[in-house]
Structures are given as C-alpha cells and as structure tokens.
Amino acid sequence: NFMYSKTVKRLSKLQEYQQYYPSLTCVMEGKDMEDWSCCPTPWTSFQSSCYFISTVMQSWTKSQNNCSVMGADLVVINTKEEQDFITQNLKINSAYFLGLSDPKGWRHWQWVDQTPYNKNVTFWHSGEPNSPDERCAIINFRSEEWGWNDVHCHVPQKSICKMKKIYI
C-alpha cells in the first residue's frame, strides 16, 4: 500500500515535469534506494546538479535567457571537482560562457544565481581577468589546462547551463 501510493505520487510528479522536459533520465539513490534523482535527457549529472552544453553561439545575455527557458542558469562553478567534471565534456578548441559577469566593469564579479563570488575558489587563467571592457567569463583550454577568461559579453560563444536535479 505504501509502495503503491509512492508510485502514484511519482507518476503524477513525472507527468507534471513532462510538460517541461519530454524525457527524464533518473537514477535511484538514497540509503534505501527509494529516491529517484533525475536530469532532463540528454543533460549530464554530477552530485546534486544537471548540466547541458549548448553549442549554439549566442551572446552572454541570450545564453543566460536560453538556460532560463529550460529552468536553469548559466553554470556556477563552486569547486575544482565540479569544473573537472564539466570539462570532460567540452571541446578544447571552444569557449563556453559561465554564469559569471561584471556588468559595470568595476571588477565586481557576480554569479547569476547570486552565489557569493569567492576569490579563493576561482580558476582564472594566468593574467586574467585583464580588461574592464570584458565583462563576461568563459571557460576555455589554454596552456595545457582549463581556466576562465574575461571576454566581451556581446560576442557569441557556446555555453553551459546548470540546474538542480529533479527529485521524485
């Protein structure tokens, strides 16, 4: 009876999400393997988040709007482990917008989701950021490593979206 009601709840939750995400990929987790955590297909998952790499070249603002339509934001990177996971799926000759910007050019960097900007957990390439006119951040591969660079916001780039996992 308990299992039956849990399944019914899950099905109604799935139907609810179906209008936004035609397909979800779910895995069982939790100590009793009773919880399902899901990401839209073909997003990838790491810890409690889902990630989508957009190969559409767009400005930073348009990229963020595009993520927003999918219920996500441009990616906020909180740890080196998270960055290492993300970069496994990136092309080394491309650049991808992050959810990090400095709209006034005052070197007051801010994350799109209002996560506090912690200078101690940043992965700027050497010498970056280097221009107050370059107010948006990308991640790219340079000098044998992945790192961040400040670029012009209006210049189209690929991008990475991030959203919280869906729990059903």
Epitope: W60, T61, P103, D133, C136, V151, H154
Partner: antibody, heavy 121, light 111 residues
Framework: EVQLVESGGGLVKPGGSLRLSCAAS????????MSWVRQAPGKRLEWVST????????YYPDSVKGRFTISRDNAKNSLYLQMNSLRAEDTAVYYC??????????????WGQGTTVTVSS | EIVLTQSPATLSLSPGERATLSCRAS??????????MHWYQQKPGQAPRLLIY???NLESGIPARFSGSGSETDFTLTISRLEPEDFAVYFC?????????FGGGTKVEIK
C-alpha cells in the same frame, strides 16, 4: 576635446582596394575599443568592424568578413580599415567611432565626420 | 540579427511641440535592469551624435529636453519642446549582441 578624423576614401573600381585611416586625439586612444560604421546613400547605418582596446579581438559582419581588416597603431593613435575585393554595395560614407562599454553592451560616444568610398566601374 | 524598426519614418512638427519617436526591436534588448538601447541624432552631412545611452541616460552636454524610456522590445525618445536645431534624423541602436544594429531612422522635419 575628442577628435576623430577619417581619410583615405575615394573612387575605386570593383575588385579594387582602399585603406582608410582614422586619426584620434583628445583621449587615451589605447584604452578604447574602436569601430568602423558605414552609411550607404539612403540606407541605415551599418556596423563594419570592431577592434578591442588591447588589440586582442577583431569582429566583422558576414558581409565584409574575409575582405576587410581592421587594425590599430596605439603608438600613432590611429585606426585603419583595409578594404579588399571591393563591391558596388560597399559604396558608403565610412565613419570611425569610439566605443564605450555599458553593462553587457556598448555604444558609440564619438564619431568622425566620415570619408566617402565609391565603388564603380 | 536583431532588427530595429523605427516609427514614424517622418514626423512633421512645429518648434515648441513635443516629439515622440518609437523604436521596436525584433527581440528583447534588455537583461534584468539593463536596457541596452541607445539614441543618436544626425544632421545632413554630419556624423551621428550620441543623445541617450542605456535607454534613459542622457549623454553629457545633451539638453534636458531629450529623454528616453522603454525596456525589452519597445523604446521611446521624447523631445519635450522642439527647438529649431532639433530638426534632424534620429537613430536607435542596440549592441546586446553582435552584430550591433541600427534603426532605419525617424526624420523630424519642420511642419
């Protein structure tokens, strides 16, 4: 006083080349992104190219990509536009303009008086 | 690219009258509180002159009779009382994404 003075325009045959120059004064030239914008007779203004302050980025619309090259010489306070394989549709007044970044975009706060380019056989 | 449509194409008014010029973008040129539309004035044989940046900010040295408003796709330039020197062509411009684009212009002429 900020001044931008263009030169180098003229009459050229289709397929020919021209090099436009823009002499800047009255401001720290190396600190600003610069653009070329053109205006064909009776048409709207059209952006032609941009070069960043540090010379690290150049941008072009598809209509001129591969034919036009923007460059700058910060020591001479000068901006250039090398135009090759010119077409009749490149006929226009060419303005150089200074860029000011504003939030996620930019605007042009000072413009030169323009130099006329006519492409005709 | 973002297409900017200005209306009317021509505005015939007398000195002292109020002028209201419209610029409509094919998609939003706003992001949160940033409205990335700018306005220029151009007189025959002259270079464009910046009037308003960021939809509503008056450029230094521009008379206070000029004002701008709007967000997303709809923007307005208002001249509260036309002076003889205000009869010219007015352009809007966006640069939220490359390529930066301009409107076709509104000509304000003496009635």
């Amino acid at each position: 006083e900020v001044q931008l003075v263009e030169s180098g325009g003229g009459l050229v045959k289709p397929g020919g080349s021209l090099r436009l120059s823009c002499a800047a004064s009255g401001f720290t030239f190396r600190s600003y992104g610069m653009s070329w914008v053109r205006q064909a007779p009776g048409k709207r203004l059209e952006w032609v190219s941009t070069i960043s302050s540090g010379d690290s980025y150049t941008y072009y619309p598809d209509s001129v990509k591969g034919r036009f090259t923007i460059s700058r010489d910060n020591a001479k306070n000068s901006l250039y536009l090398q135009m090759n394989s010119l077409r009749a549709e490149d006929t226009a007044v060419y303005y150089c303009a200074r860029q000011i970044y504003y939030d996620y975009a930019y605007y042009f706060d000072f413009w030169g008086q323009g130099t006329t380019v006519t492409v005709s056989s | 690219e973002i297409v900017l449509t200005q209306s009317p194409a021509t505005l015939s008014l007398s000195p002292g009258e109020r002028a209201t010029l419209s610029c409509r973008a094919s998609e939003s040129v706003s992001f949160r509180t940033s409205h990335l539309m700018h306005w220029y004035q151009q007189k025959p044989g002259q270079a464009p002159r910046l009037l308003i940046y960021g939809a509503s900010n008056l450029e230094s040295g521009i008379p206070a009779r000029f004002s701008g408003s709007g967000s997303e796709t709809d923007f307005t330039l208002t001249i509260s009382r036309l002076e003889p020197e205000d009869f010219a062509v007015y352009f809007c411009q966006q640069s939220i994404e490359d390529p930066p684009t301009f409107g076709g212009g509104t000509k304000v002429e003496i009635k």
